[in-house]
Every structure is written in C-alpha cells, then in structure tokens.
Amino acid sequence: MEDEKPKVNPKLYMCVCEGLSCGNEDHCEGQQCFSSLSINDGFHVYQKGCFQVYEQGKMTCKTPPSPGQAVECCQGDWCNRNITAQLPTKGKSFPGTQNFHLE
C-alpha cells in the first residue's frame, strides 16, 4: 500500500460554532457550515455550527425561510463567520420579539 494518506471522503470545513449544541467549543468541523435564526418564546435565537455529514443538513439547508426560522448553509473554512440568517420579513421585526444570541 502507498505511504501517503488516502483521499477518500469530501473535505471537512472548519465552522464557527455558537449555541447550546457547541458546549465549550467555539468551532466545529463538518461537510457544511450553517447560520440559523429561529423564534423561540418570542426571542430571536441565533445559532451557528456545522453539519458533520451531508445528510444532516440536506433537508435543513434546502428549506426556504419561514416566519419562524431561517437557515443559511455554506461550504468553506469559516464560511459562516460573517453570515447572519434573516427571516423572510426582512427589515421588519415581529411584535413582542427581541434578539437573543444563544451562547
């Protein structure tokens, strides 16, 4: 067998990780990065992270934004760093909601 490392699977990307699922980590590695915004009990909840394997993000990334949730996905190292997902009613805030970054 060859001495070099094989190249078998797609490249994994380094992603910014922000939110409860990140634990103490500020980054994660996966086949796709994401930035999401959802409304939870009147709060705007922002999260960032990665989908480790393609299937995890397959449906989520293709789902168009709704009044309650928006997800933007990308492929590239740290590609979600400057992405902020936005709900479809761009520029308008929902009554009784406030921004909240889930750390």
Partner: antibody, heavy 122, light 106 residues
C-alpha cells in the same frame, strides 16, 4: 435507512474474471468513500479496496493490487469490483462497506452489505 | 502496515458473566479503533468506534477503552445473543483488522 446489497458472486475458474456490484440506498452515495472487505469462510476479515466519494482516488490491499479494480457510478448509486486473474485464495465472501465519512483520509465502516460469495475453483 | 493482534483467540464464558477482549496495535493508532460483532451467516455489526464510543442502538453492557496501542472491549454481563466473533479494526493508517476473538458459551 442505509442499505447495501452486493451481487455478482459465483463459482469461477482460476485465471478468469468476475465483476461484483453493490447497490446503495438510504444515504447520499456520492458523498462517501466506499470499501470492499472480504472474508474467507470461517476466517477473518481483510480490507480489499476503497474508492473515494467522487471516484477519483482508488486504493488497494497488497494481495489484490494489479488484479482488482474498484469503480463506482454515482448516478446509479452503485459500487463495482472488477476481479481479474482470479486465484483460489481469492475465494471469500465479499462485503461492501460504507465509510463513516468524518475523516478525509477515511474512517471506520459504519454500514455493511450482507456479502456475496466468490468461489475460485477448477 | 499496522498489525492488529487480538487475544484470546477463543473465550469461554457463561451467560451473565463478564467478558474482556483485548486488541493490540503494532504502533500508535491514537483512538482510531472500532469493534465489530459478527454472528454466523451475518455481516459484521459496528459496536464501538473511536475506541470508546458506542454505536447507535448498542446496549450499554458493551464498552470499549484504551488508546495508543492497547485496547479492550468489555461485555459486562453476557446475554445469549452476545455469543459471536468480535473483530477490532484500526483506521488510523489505512485499514487492518485483528484476527478475531470467538466468544463461546462455557
């Protein structure tokens, strides 16, 4: 649900050829490396070959290098193993196995097919 | 090539007892080790990956430990369905299996 189904096994004479197929479903086939692993009945497991997710990179175990060719058709979700110059010691159950995919250089095998038996005998 | 050595070759255990299987790598493989269970006429089934993480649906009585070159699979209380052949796989540098340990009913 991940499903891998091998086919194409059978009895073949030494020196002849055989092509195995592995039909995959339940996952995004084109995003994962896929392996062939074989097992002489009643004996241990031996890694045979792997092909990268895009089919561009192929790697083989020393015992089959130069005789076996691994390939894939991502449009058909199917993996192949072309086995030439077969020898009696190639007699084995051949399994296809999905790579977990969380390491560019290859990972462990998280799903296996049920195997297809190849018997090389005169 | 990394050589994986499993011991013992055969382990005779009574139902309800603990079984301890060993796998040794010829060089450091970090934690890149998986354990598989294979029953007669079936394909191998993933039990443990990353040396110590149980795969989905695997009962808590199976647990793996070790890193570097020495690894252990422990079955805390053997059930009748656990009797099988167990293989370790290193995936740190290409892929090589141990020769297997058969766990049989005492």
């Amino acid at each position: 649900q991940v499903h891998l189904v091998e086919s194409g096994g059978g009895v073949v004479q030494p020196g002849r050829s055989l092509r195995l197929s592995c039909a995959a479903s339940g996952f995004t086939f084109s995003n994962y490396g896929i392996h062939w692993v074989r097992q002489v009945p009643g004996k241990g497991l031996e890694w045979v070959a792997v092909i990268s997710y895009d089919g561009n990179n192929k790697y083989y175990g020393d015992s089959v290098k130069g005789r076996f060719t691994i390939s894939r058709d991502n449009s058909k979700n199917t993996l192949y193993l072309q086995m030439n110059s077969l020898r009696p010691e190639d007699t084995a159950i051949y399994y296809c196995a999905k790579d977990r995919g969380l390491d560019t250089a290859g990972d462990y095998f998280d799903y296996w097919g049920q195997g297809t038996l190849v018997t090389v005998s005169s | 090539e990394i050589v994986m050595t499993q011991s013992p070759a055969t382990l005779s255990v009574s139902t309800g007892e603990r079984a301890t299987l060993s796998c040794r790598a010829s060089q450091n493989i970090s934690s890149k080790l998986a354990w598989y269970q294979q029953k007669p006429g079936q394909a191998p089934r993933l039990l443990i990956y990353g040396a110590s993480t149980r795969a989905s649906g695997i009962p808590a009585r199976f647990w793996g430990s070790g890193s570097g070159t020495e690894f252990t699979l422990t079955i805390s209380s053997l059930q009748s369905e656990d009797f099988a052949v167990f293989y370790c796989l290193q995936y740190n540098n290409w892929w090589t299996f141990g020769q297997g340990t058969k766990v049989e009913i005492k």
